[in-house]
């Protein structure tokens, strides 16, 4: 079976479909949740929806084999299997591994450490979001892009305030948080 990966945002409507056309005049078509839990089946010209957590929020298009699921949640994370029984008795199957992610929340920037060192301002900032597996990127007047939840930098004496932005992202969303410092080493605003 061919395996396709799909990542979507929770609460969205999703279409599970295959990239090729269905076998001509197939006999039966079934969508499964995991290996063997039936969601819907097409047989003898009609669709039968099974008692499952999807009942009432799925629809099958027998022409294309596409399965529409409304309002997906993280609990819908699974491998979905479409099995088609052809007229000659041979089976074909396609698998879609669906990953449902919540949109990332706005990050909170915390000052872990702030001290004056020889007229310079040493800063250690952390970008915090609750228990998510995300990517971090810091932007600002930095020698290089930092892809870490913690930013450590030293500010030379400066006239204007300096701002640092932490961007948290997963594959379906991203949010920014910004923290500014005014000279010499004063937290101005976030």
């Amino acid at each position: 079976g061919r395996l396709v990966h799909m990542t979507v945002v929770s609460g969205s409507n999703v279409t599970l479909n295959i990239s090729e056309s269905l076998p001509e005049n197939y006999k039966q078509l079934t969508w499964f949740y995991t290996f063997d839990q039936k969601i819907v089946e097409w047989d003898s010209g009609k669709s039968k929806y099974f008692e499952s957590k999807f009942k009432g929020r799925v629809r099958l298009d027998p022409q294309s084999g596409a399965l529409y699921i409304s309002k997906v949640q993280k609990e819908d994370n699974s491998t979905y299997v479409m099995r088609v029984l052809k007229k000659d008795g041979y089976e074909q199957e396609w698998k879609i591994k669906l990953q449902v992610l919540d949109p990332v929340p706005k990050p909170v920037i915390k000052i872990e450490k702030r001290e004056d060192v020889d007229d310079n301002c040493y800063l250690k900032l952390s970008c915090v979001i609750p228990g998510e597996s995300v990517n971090y990127t810091w932007y600002g007047e930095l020698p290089k892009e930092i892809q870490n939840s913690v930013l450590e930098t030293t500010l030379k004496p400066h006239k204007h305030s300096r701002c640092y932005t932490c961007q948290v992202s997963n594959s379906v969303s991203s949010k920014n948080g910004t923290f500014c410092f005014s000279p010499p080493c004063t937290a101005a605003r976030s």
Partner: antibody, heavy 117, light 107 residues
């Protein structure tokens, strides 16, 4: 010509385990299923479980849960079925069958397993 | 589990006779039914899948019908080589379950 070739007859003592192999020869499928079915002397057919060596999915009949295990060696296209804590009632011919999910278009010749003290 | 009940348990008929075996499922299985023939000392052989589709290489005297809970296997003109035990099997759900078998003997 696709064939399911099974290992030979086994004689076991009660409480022991037996491991039966089933090799899919001549097949070129990337995805196939192997079911295990047994038949006690003079009795009907009893489905034991299914495995898909391609993705590792396995499902056992409740009756055998806890003492059956299906494993595979994809490099040799061989599936194994191990049944433990054998009892005299496990005396049967054990068939592997496939290659479809829904029904069995191909069967091995069967492996007789005798459980006797 | 879905129970499969076959009848009759045995049938004795002459060459050329029409033989009918029925199979009843304890719940709706749509057309997820297969029929197998087994000869003594041999592995079963698939005859019919999806209730009515003839497996490749199986003689056309074998036919299957039915859907839901009631199914029939018909041998339109019994041949000497058709002796053996016939099993129905539901393929709708796990565990896959078989009927208890119908033994067909030639008079």
């Amino acid at each position: 010509q696709v064939q399911l070739v099974q290992s030979g007859a086994e004689v076991k003592k009660p409480g022991a385990s037996v491991k039966v192999s089933c090799k899919a020869s001549g097949h070129t499928f990337t995805n196939y299923y192997i079911h295990w079915v047994r038949q006690a002397p003079g009795q009907g057919l009893e489905w034991m479980g299914i495995t898909n060596p391609n993705d590792g999915n396995t499902r056992y009949a409740q009756k055998f849960q806890g003492r059956i295990s299906m494993t595979w060696d994809t490099s040799t296209s061989t599936v194994f079925m191990e049944l433990s804590s054998l009892k005299s009632e496990d005396t049967a011919v054990y068939y592997c069958a496939g290659l479809r999910y829904w029904f069995f278009d191909l069967w091995g010749r069967g492996t007789p397993v005798t459980v006797s003290s | 589990d879905i129970q499969m009940t076959q009848s009759p348990s045995s049938v004795s008929a002459s060459v050329g006779d029409r033989v009918t075996i029925t199979c009843r499922a304890s719940q709706d299985i749509s057309s997820w039914l297969a029929w197998y023939q087994q000869k003594p000392g041999k592995a079963p052989n698939l005859l019919i899948f999806a209730a009515s589709s003839l497996q490749s290489g199986v003689p056309s005297r074998f036919s299957g019908s039915g859907s839901g809970t009631d199914f029939t296997l018909t041998i339109s003109s019994l041949q000497p080589e058709d002796f053996g035990t016939y099993y129905c099997q539901q393929t709708d759900n796990f565990p896959r379950t078989f009927g208890q078998g119908t033994k067909v003997e030639i008079n």
